[in-house]
Amino acid sequence: PEPPTACREKQYLINSQCCSLCQPGQKLVSDCTEFTETECLPCGESEFLDTWNRETHCHQHKYCDPNLGLRVQQKGTSETDTICTCEEGWHCTSEACESCVLHRSCSPGFGVKQIATGVSDTICEPCPVGFFSNVSSAFEKCHPWTSCETKDLVVQQAGTNKTDVVCGPQDRLRA
């Protein structure tokens, strides 16, 4: 018979022969032959392979180094890598999450549009007219100016993006 030029799923071509790939969590020890099956071995502790493969070495689990602000989100297994995230108040500096930085605070005049997560930083937005923020915060949104009218008061001092309006009593008309 003609030697194959392509193999089925979960197989690979070697020496004009289709061999079975090793399943996730196992590495290749020896290719199959005309007489023997592919030989695979389980990955060692703290190692993994996450696909059907012909790798001769397993990959090492990622280390979520607490000194870099990292913690484990999902423990590694023989078939999956460890997933790291950041400690509370910190977020990853990259998609691979190899280190963490402190969440950014929004300065006065800016409010939090989106609170930071373990993988994304705080998103700030300028306070629009009618709103203010007088603190630097990683949580506070822009607050609406106080409505003097609803309190039967009048505006004594206009608000800004950093300060609330100041309300005062209405001037009594003298008789």
């Epitope: 996730p24 969590g25 389980p42 990955c43 060692g44 502790e45 703290s46 190692e47 996450d50 090492q60 689990h61 280390y63 979520c64 913690r71 484990v72 989100q73 999902q74 423990k75 590694g76 297994t77 023989s78 078939e79 999956t80 890598d81």
Partner: antibody, heavy 119, light 113 residues
Framework: EVQLVESGGGLVKPGGSLRLSCAAS????????MHWVRQAPGKGLEWVAY????????YYADTVKGRFTISRDNAKNSLYLQMNSLRAEDTALYYC????????????WAQGTLVTVSS | DIVMTQSPDSLAVSLGERATMSCKSS????????????LTWHQQKPGQPPKLLIY???TRESGVPDRFSGSGSGTDFTLTISSLQAEDVAVYYC?????????FGGGTKVEIK
Amino acid sequence: EVQLVESGGGLVKPGGSLRLSCAASGFTFSDYGMHWVRQAPGKGLEWVAYISSGNRIIYYADTVKGRFTISRDNAKNSLYLQMNSLRAEDTALYYCARQDGYRYAMDYWAQGTLVTVSS
Amino acid sequence: DIVMTQSPDSLAVSLGERATMSCKSSQSLLNSGNQKNYLTWHQQKPGQPPKLLIYWTSTRESGVPDRFSGSGSGTDFTLTISSLQAEDVAVYYCQNDYTYPLTFGGGTKVEIK
């Protein structure tokens, strides 16, 4: 037959130090991750620390971070727990336990060694 | 940290009867990569260290009798002893094996009625 035998427990004053050892036999020690787990008298189980087979990965419970140090010597088939700045709340039976690279669970536990912190 | 909550605290069952205990986790224990739930059950008999009973929610450890079975997924898990034997008197702990810190439930004490 898998065997894990601890030693080093005892009575120590608050603020004192103690070093626990766990001697392994009946399996290839360097192929396994290892844990320390403790159990206060009459209470449940509390995980303390983990060290990977090759010493590369170490994790601690927040309650012991900065005070306890887990280590291993694969040549001596031994696991250690150095405990400093001991507190009354560290009083417990300390178990070493093995973690394999397949189940990723603690599949064998030692008998435990008692640590008592009291003045 | 993942909080593991077991119920009931204790359970008295007649010999040969079924014993069922529950374990709830404060977040999912499902590994997104291999679709296994990393929930482990340990048995601790009086005066003995814990012993691995079940891993990956429902896989019995070698040598564990088939009267022990585990089920559940995500955050809700159950351990069942189909026909209680005298040697099953113990405290049963569920454990989060999904992430660090590893956390245990408070345990369910199984006694003979």
